[in-house]
Structures are given as structure tokens and as C-alpha cells.
Amino acid sequence: MKVLQEPACVSDYMSISTCEWKMGGPTNCSAELRLLYQLVFQSSETHTCVPENNGGVGCVCHLLMDDVVSMDNYTLDLWAGQQLLWKGSFKPSEHVKPRAPGNLTVHTNVSDTVLLTWSNPYPPDNYLYNDLTYAVNIWSENDPAYSRIHNVTYLKPTLRIPASTLKSGISYRARVRAWAQHYNTTWSEWSPSTKWYNSYREPFEQR
């Protein structure tokens, strides 16, 4: 049994780190493999993660952690029974992928404006809470040529779009993702998308 692609891990900087790797052949990850992890810290214990399959030769493991701080460093050992397949380390603060924003809602009852709101995925006491900026993707199912990214570089998780910039009488979808500038993170996954119908019509005199 051999590791084809070494484990690569990202942290949500809250309670979960996700490690993914590829094996040299088809593997029943949960039956054959264990990923052991231990914080380099006084009197810390070794913890075990049971991986899941992620495609035919891919495995993924979700490591449960405490809150993350910048000093944290983990040793990782990938075992197949009594055989050590791979040994490495992981510093969560240097490999952060934020959680996806949630509760994306579209408010169309505001005159002339489409208001999008969503929730910050972190509690106020988390370091990432005040560091997230967002990208909102809006596209149309009726007009495949229409797709826009709106960068939200302020802290408030809202975006206002003049309804007049969207075509009337067609449906749009929106999704949002986040990243944290000062932690040099990757982008989060996209939130689930939300659909709405743009019924706004310009006043007659403006037509």
C-alpha cells in the first residue's frame, strides 16, 4: 500500500481541519487507514481520525480540533494497520480555508434595489470574524452570458444592487464566498445559491 499524493490539509480556523490525499490504488479508506494527529504541546495526547473515501483512490479526513491559535503545530501520521505510510506536520494558521458564509437572503421589497444579506460563518470571538471579505457571484439561468462577481471589501455582510442593472422579468441566482486577507487564506467554498425573480420595471418616463 502506497501514498500517491501526500496529505494536504486546510483549517477552518475554528474546530475542523480537513486533510485530503490519494492512494496508489483503490482503497477502502475507513477500513484500511487511520490518520493520527497530535498537537505539539505539553502533555497532549494522540487523536485518531477515520478517513472517508473521496473518489476511487482519494481519502479525506476531518480532524476535530480545539480553537486554533497561531502557535499550534500538529504532527500527522498516516497508518495502514501497523505500517506507517507517511509522516508530516501541519500548522493550521498557515493553511486556512474559511467556512462558507450562510443564510444568503435576497430582499426585493426595497425600492429600486436588490439587497443581498448573508451571515458571517464565525462567532464574534473568532479571529477571522472581523477579517472576512466576500465575493458575491450573480448569474442568470435565462441569460447564460450574464455572470458577475461583486467584491465586498467592507465588513458588513450585505450587497446592494440597483434593480435597474438587472434585466426585468427573468430569474437570477446568487452565491457568496469569503476569504481573510490578514491570514492569507484561500477562498471558502461557495454558499448554497439563492434564486429570485427580478420583477422590477423602470418608471414609464425613464423608458
Partner: antibody
Framework: EVQLVESGGGLEQPGGSLRLSCAGS????????MTWVRQAPGKGLEWVSS????????YYADSVKGRFTISRDNSKNTLYLQMNSLRAEDTAVYYC??????????????????WGQGTTVTVSS | DIVMTQSPLSLPVTPGEPASISCTSS???????????VDWYLQKSGQSPQLLIY???KRASGVPDRFSGSGSGTDFTLKISRVEAEDVGFYYC?????????FGQGTKLEIK
């Protein structure tokens, strides 16, 4: 009541052996790391050894490494210190102390918040 | 190994007056914001040590609020706002960030 009670001290000749015990009660013993600290007559406190809650990880002062062995029996809520090749400079009162909560991924530290009454070890010919 | 240096080594105090003991470590004991791995212990004559302060500034259960800990990184202080007769004994700082745990030399607090 959270309590630690040491035993096993006594008079031993240089080169001899002693086994100290520390019985814990009033807390979930296996969840906590444990520590031994000693105090030579008229001197300050000196850390001797520590062990994680599971017993998988042990730590020793250079002065006792290779001679002392820390262990625990969580089924008996008891901590041990096996002392071999004893020297005159090992003469001290030995205390056990409750250390950090080590079942969490990052052990939670609340100080060495409970200490035993101490057991005296005298090494002399 | 980390070295812990305590001062003064002797501290005569008048009851009701404040007292202050300093402890300096040879390397930072700050693991993360608010988590300085330094403790303060009091050992009264003929007794086992007792915990006063842990993680730099957190008062242990049952410890009177006249005791307080402060500092960060390498410099730490134990303050007693108003010394009482029962406070006499040896005070020790200890680094608990990593083994070997290291105690300061001890400060003998006595009543004038």
C-alpha cells in the same frame, strides 16, 4: 473532595530503589496529566517528572532521566514513581500534583491545582 | 531549558501594606493571546505548595482577591494588595509552557 495521597517514602541506601505511589480521588483521574515535584531539605521546588492522562507520554528532568520511571494505573486512580539507582542528592520530600486536562486536543491548563501532602525519601548509607 | 529568575529573594512587609514579587523568564511564555504559561505558588511552613495564580493572571479557586498576577511574555509580577499575617511563606513562580517545568528560586515573605 479532590485529594492526592502519597506513600512509599522511606530510608534507602545509595544505589537502592523505592517506589512512590500517589492515590487520586474526587476527580476523573484518567483525564488529567500528573506531575511529581520534589524539595530537598532547606531548598526550593524542583520538577521531577510528568505523565499525560493516558500514560502514553512521559517527561523527565535531566537529573533523574534513566533512573526514575513515571507510570500510572488509571483503573486504580494511582500514579507511581519508580526510583532506581538512588543517590544522596535524591533526598527530598516528593509531592504529586494534578496537572492539565489532557483529553482535549489542546490540553487545558488550570495550574498544578491539587498537591499531595508529600512523602519523604532519604538516601543515606 | 527555560530559566526563571525571581526577585527579591527576601521580602519583609508590614501588615496592611502591599507587596510585589517579580519573575523573569529566559524566553517568552506566551503561547497565544491571554495565555502566558506562568504560575505562582505559596508554600507555608511545613505545608505542601498551594496554587495562587495560573496562566499569568488567573486566580485559583479559593484564593483571596488581594492576590493578583500580571505580565506577559517574559516579565511577570505577583502583587498582594494588603499583606496579612497568614501570607507568610515562600512564593515561587513556575513556567508550565513545556517540560522541564522550572521554578524560580523562591521569595521569602515575612512580617516586619
Amino acid at each position: 473532595e479532590v485529594q492526592l495521597v502519597e506513600s512509599g517514602g522511606g530510608l534507602e541506601q545509595p544505589g537502592g530503589s523505592l517506589r512512590l505511589s500517589c492515590a487520586g480521588s474526587g476527580f476523573t483521574f484518567r483525564d488529567f496529566a500528573m506531575t511529581w515535584v520534589r524539595q530537598a531539605p532547606g531548598k526550593g521546588l524542583e520538577w521531577v517528572s510528568s505523565i499525560s492522562g493516558s500514560g502514553d507520554n512521559t517527561y523527565y528532568a535531566d537529573s533523574v532521566k534513566g533512573r526514575f520511571t513515571i507510570s500510572r494505573d488509571n483503573s486504580k486512580n494511582t500514579l507511581y514513581l519508580q526510583m532506581n539507582s538512588l543517590r544522596a542528592e535524591d533526598t527530598a520530600v516528593y509531592y504529586c500534583a494534578k496537572d492539565r486536562l489532557s483529553i482535549t486536543v489542546r490540553p487545558r491548563y488550570y495550574g498544578l491545582d491539587v498537591w499531595g501532602q508529600g512523602t519523604t525519601v532519604t538516601v543515606s548509607s | 531549558d527555560i530559566v526563571m529568575t525571581q526577585s527579591p529573594l527576601s521580602l519583609p512587609v508590614t501588615p496592611g501594606e502591599p507587596a510585589s514579587i517579580s519573575c523573569t523568564s529566559s524566553q517568552s511564555l506566551l503561547y497565544s493571546i491571554g495565555y502566558n504559561y506562568v504560575d505562582w505558588y505559596l508554600q507555608k511552613s511545613g505545608q505542601s505548595p498551594q496554587l495562587l495564580i495560573y496562566l499569568g493572571n488567573k486566580r485559583a479557586s479559593g484564593v483571596p482577591d488581594r492576590f493578583s498576577g500580571s505580565g506577559s511574555g517574559t516579565d511577570f509580577t505577583l502583587k498582594i494588595s494588603r499583606v496579612e499575617a497568614e501570607d507568610v511563606g515562600f512564593y515561587y513562580c513556575m513556567q508550565s509552557l513545556q517540560t522541564p517545568y522550572v521554578f524560580g528560586q523562591g521569595t521569602k515573605l515575612e512580617i516586619k
